[in-house]
């Protein structure tokens, strides 16, 4: 009668350098096992409604689930189950071949710090205190944490704030970047991907909220000091940021080698692998360290661009120096060059 | 603070059924997956139903085809319809849900008082 809902179920996240995504490994009465996506009678491809894994991501001290499918960059340990009945029950589950395992990925959001809620109702007595100034980021549906539209609250009003693009403002970024806990600011949003077209549909919570802000001073150091409330403008930009902490992050993994620490790279754009095709903007090894890091890798012994003499080879661009900071991969349709990284295998 | 008040249980005969409610307040900005447990006497609690926030639901065997989970997203409420039942269903339970406080919180845990059900036969 075991499942992941059950209080005192056990589960870890392994081969990433995160506690909140990567492979999952299940504990029973026998010791740890990965878990086979083709369990509960899914297909080895099929994604699910993440959300059915809150109570996984909870014990692990993470957000709310972003994904649950497969993890592809399978690594099988000794032991691998497939599991039988309902999504998530452990009940009914047998040891499967290795090479027949394609393991389970669930990728948790890396949680804010905040403290944790008190579960002693305050006294009837005491009134209610004015909520301090807070910010938002309202993210397109489906969209990532840290990237959106800015909303600032002040007492119980709250909107968008109005941005012209001439508006030198990199200080103020950084300040609502880190104010947020999402880092450092990387770059303004347009607004068809920040989210700013509603779908009538949507929940009365991400409606436009009816104040709107004017930035008042770029170099403020609290958040009262940088807004001004205007009247509604039909038209215009509202600021829309992307700051450094956005989740997800840039998936990748290494193919075609002897182990998981060697091989082409490729990323991930949405459920879709493609090559990571090599950029003369961000030739130093520290690309590939992170893309080590990610397998669970040690640093890299070497990296080669293979020569790109096909000019129908396709695969994915990322302008930036780290593939952390890529917000988005750019296609590039013909002439990719391919990189063959060899990392450190921490069990050779 | 978070609160998960349970209403609806009672006593009830063999073959009868009870709806459970169960109400969430409090500061929360999202919740993810929605439960209900059960304790019998000197048994350790046991997952009843689940519905996560996609609509997904998980049922204990021995509640399958008798009992059904629903919920209200707008109202932060959570029922459990249960019909058929039987004297082994009797136990207190318990409400139970995984909120973040803000966008991006971590996902924190409450549970209700719980609400005893008694079916005899």
């Known amino acids: 009668r075991l499942s992941w809902y059950d209080p005192d179920f056990q589960a870890r996240l392994t081969r990433s350098n995160s506690k909140c995504q990567g492979q999952l490994e299940v504990y029973l009465k026998d010791g740890w096992h990965m878990v086979c996506s083709q369990s509960w009678g899914r297909s080895s491809k099929q994604w699910e409604d993440p959300s059915q894994a809150s109570k996984v991501c909870q014990r692990l001290n993470c957000g709310v689930p972003l994904s649950l499918g497969p993890f592809l960059v399978t690594y099988t340990p000794q032991s691998s189950i497939i599991c039988y009945g309902q999504l998530g029950s452990f009940s009914n589950c047998s040891h499967s071949r290795n090479d027949m395992c394609h393991s389970l990925g669930l990728t948790c959001l890396e949680p804010q710090k905040t403290t944790p809620p008190t579960t002693r109702p305050p006294p009837t007595t005491t009134p209610e205190p004015t909520a301090p100034p807070r910010l938002q980021l309202v993210a397109q549906s489906g969209g990532q944490h840290c990237a959106g539209v800015v909303e600032f609250y002040s007492g119980s009003l709250g909107g968008t704030i109005s941005y012209e693009a001439q508006d030198k403002t990199q200080d103020l970024e950084n300040f609502l970047c880190n104010n947020l806990q999402c880092g450092s600011f990387l770059k303004h949003l347009p607004e068809t991907e920040a989210g700013r077209a509603q779908d009538p549909g949507e929940p009365r919570e991400h409606q436009p909220l009816p104040i709107q802000w004017k930035i008042q001073n770029s170099s403020c150091t609290s958040l009262e000091h940088c807004f001004r409330k205007i009247k509604p403008q039909k038209s215009g930009r509202v600021l829309a940021l992307l700051c450094s902490g956005f989740q997800p992050k840039v998936q990748s993994r290494l193919v075609g080698g002897s182990s998981i620490c060697e091989g082409t790279v490729e990323v991930r754009q949405g459920a879709q692998w493609a090559a990571l095709c090599d950029s003369s903007s961000a030739r130093s090894s520290l690309r590939w360290e992170e893309v080590c890091r990610e397998q669970q890798c040690g640093s890299v012994n070497s990296y080669r661009v293979l020569d790109a003499g096909d000019p129908t080879s396709r695969g994915l661009f990322c302008p930036h120096q780290k593939l952390s900071q890529c917000h988005e991969l750019w296609e590039r349709n013909s002439y990719c060059k391919k990189v063959f990284v060899t990392c450190q295998d921490p069990n050779p | 603070q978070v609160q998960l008040v349970e209403s609806g249980g009672g006593l009830v005969q063999a073959g009868g059924s009870l709806r459970l409610s169960c109400a969430a307040s409090?500061?929360?900005?999202?919740?993810?997956?929605m439960g209900w447990y059960r304790q019998a006497p000197g048994k350790e609690r046991e997952t009843v139903a689940v519905i996560s926030s996609g609509g997904s639901t998980y049922y204990a065997d021995s509640v399958k085809g008798r009992f059904t989970i629903s919920r209200d997203n707008a109202k932060n409420t959570l029922y459990l319809q249960m019909n058929s039942l039987k004297p082994e269903d009797t136990a207190v339970y318990y409400c139970?849900?995984?909120?973040?406080?803000?966008?991006?919180?971590?996902?924190?845990?409450?549970w209700g008082q719980g609400t005893q059900v008694t079916v005899s036969s």
């Open positions: 409090g500061s929360i900005f999202s919740i993810s997956v």
């Open positions: 139970n849900a995984d909120f973040e406080t803000a966008s991006g919180s971590p996902l924190y845990e409450s």
